[in-house]
């Protein structure tokens, strides 16, 4: 075992090429200079090697490397990505978005690994906070990426970034993520007018505060019932028959069908019998005629 | 002369798994500069690399991204074959299935492949 | 974008050459791979043509005839198979491939048609 350290005659290599596919293990660790291989990091790519001549590489820039690959290397690992452990990223310090993208690139088409979570963890911290820039590639590759970021790290997200934003990255976020998101995104869009502010804020809205949605019922924004079903139900409940009448516009007989599901169903049990028949669609479930409402969170605020 | 022959259902329903089998003659599928491969083609792909598998001191499988998770190649060296399962079939499945050789001494070129399976994904 | 994009269609007349391009995406540069090249007739596999990675690094295939050759143009960053003296029997399908980010890439093939 011992004379296979030592490289064979006329087998050290001089550049990494597919000559390379032909060597053993052994001959890899003994005749590959790590300096070379970390300067020829992009020939990898293109070399069909076997996943033992991988972790044979891999470890080559591991002793060339014990505190974490620099970035010129890491830029062009490839698929030797996957072959990193989180622990093996930790120690990287990666700052350049070309960088990042090349090595989402080769998860492609992957689930969010712990290995590209740890990434993308390392990248943002480097840069301090989640720029447009950043965020635009993030959710190109994963659309769900920005739900998967718990409210304290959505704080960071400046309200520039959030033009980067489509809907469909919004769509697994739950109401806390949203809470965060929404004061950003009216932000971000105050500046536009009526129309398309509302096209561009539709998204966020499982955010908005009642006094918003109030706002929003006088500007004939005729929102979807899709919208409204994801509305915060504490929001929706103190809106009027006639408020929401204006806020659905042509959309509001789509009411009927959702009578039974929040926030429907217990903004129902809040209006008056009689303003709920005003809308002619059946809703039945609200405040009999002759009733008293009692608003009692007032009422404490009183005493 | 190696020459591989492939076997298997042609016409498999949705949801169901696709099986294929390719049998090597005048090879081993344990030979240490040989890879084992799958793949398909069909008019809306095209050619499309499934997976490969090797064994070099143990077995080892590479699977391309677009079939990751639902995949798996293995080798029966007392049949001196390998195989090809797909789950959960859906009709883009459809395609000419073929097995091929990837010869180390060609860089890993497919130099002999398997006559084709057309495999229909349908109800 | 397709990592390798090839025309999908070429005629020539018999005894003529073929230039058969196949672009590698940008940002793959060409230079540091091997272009493999198949053929394939209706009803039957791709049958290997010949492999190229430079001019002192290229394979042809067993029993493949010398009239079919490769090269790359660095400038468009693509691998080029040249057909010459092109005969009737090389009317068929013509896929590039190559060995990218762990996993086997084909072109969508060009269908040469000898006039």
């Known amino acids: 075992e011992v004379e296979k350290t030592a490289c064979p005659s006329g087998k050290k290599a001089r550049e990494i090429d597919e000559s390379l596919i032909f060597y053993k293990k052994w001959e890899l660790e003994a005749c590959v200079d790590a300096a070379l291989l970390a300067t020829q990091m992009d020939r990898v790519n293109a070399i069909p090697f076997t996943y033992e001549q991988l972790d044979v590489l891999k470890h080559k820039l591991d002793e060339l490397y014990p505190q974490g690959y620099p970035e010129s290397v890491i830029q062009h690992l490839g698929y030797l990505f996957l072959k990193m452990s989180p622990e093996d990223i930790r120690k990287w310090n990666v700052t350049s978005l070309e960088t990042l993208k090349a090595l989402l690139e080769v998860n492609k088409g992957h689930e969010m690994s712990p290995q590209v979570a740890t990434l993308i963890d390392r990248f943002v911290k480097g840069r301090g906070q989640l720029d447009k820039d950043t965020l635009d590639t993030l959710t190109a590759f994963y659309p769900g990426y920005l739900c998967s970021l718990s409210p304290e790290e959505l704080s960071s997200v400046p309200p520039s970034s959030i033009w980067a934003v489509r809907p469909q990255d919004l769509d697994t976020c739950d109401p806390r993520q949203l809470d965060v998101l929404y004061p950003k995104a009216r932000l971000a869009f105050q500046n536009m007018n009526g129309s398309e502010y509302f096209v561009k804020i539709q998204s966020f809205l499982g955010g908005a505060p009642t006094e918003d949605l109030k706002a929003l019922s006088q500007q004939n924004v005729s929102m979807d019932l899709a919208t409204f079903m994801k509305l915060r139900t504490d929001a929706v409940l103190p809106l009027t028959v006639a408020e929401v009448q204006k806020l659905l516009g042509p959309h509001v007989e789509g009411l009927k069908a959702e009578e039974r599901h929040r926030p429907v169903r217990d903004w129902i049990l809040r209006q008056r019998q009689d303003d709920l028949d005003t809308l002619g669609l059946g809703l039945q479930g609200g405040i009999p005629n002759g009733y008293l409402v009692l608003d009692l969170s007032m009422q404490e605020a009183l005493s | 002369q190696v020459q591989l022959e492939q076997s298997g259902l042609g016409l498999v329903k949705p949801s169901q798994t696709l099986s294929l089998t390719c049998a090597i003659s005048g090879d081993t599928v344990s030979s240490d500069s040989a890879a084992w491969n799958w793949i398909r083609q069909s008019p809306s792909r095209g050619l499309e690399w499934l997976g490969r598998t090797y064994y070099r001191s143990k077995w080892f499988n590479d699977y391309a991204v677009s079939v990751k998770g639902r995949i798996t190649i293995n080798s029966d060296t007392s049949k001196n074959q390998f195989s090809l399962q797909l789950n959960s079939v859906t009709p883009e499945d459809t395609a000419v299935y073929y097995c091929?050789?990837?010869?180390?001494?060609?860089?890993?070129?497919?130099?002999?492949w398997g006559q084709g399976t057309l495999v229909t994904v349908s109800s | 974008q397709a990592v390798l994009t090839q025309p999908s269609s070429l005629s020539a007349s018999p005894g003529a050459s073929a230039s058969l391009t196949c672009t590698l995406r940008?940002?793959?540069?060409?230079?540091?791979?091997?272009i493999y090249w198949y053929q394939q007739r209706p009803g039957s596999p791709p049958q290997i043509l010949l492999t190229y990675k430079s001019d002192s690094d290229k394979y042809q295939g067993s029993g493949v005839p010398s009239r079919f050759s490769g090269s790359k143009d660095a400038s468009a960053n693509a691998g080029i198979l040249l057909i010459s003296g092109l005969q009737s029997e090389d009317e068929a399908d013509y896929y590039c491939m190559i060995w990218h980010s762990g996993g086997w890439v084909f072109g969508g093939g060009t269908k040469v048609t000898v006039l």
């Open positions: 940008s940002g793959i540069n060409v230079g540091i791979y091997r």
């Open positions: 091929a050789r990837s010869n180390s001494y060609y860089y890993y070129a497919m130099d002999v």
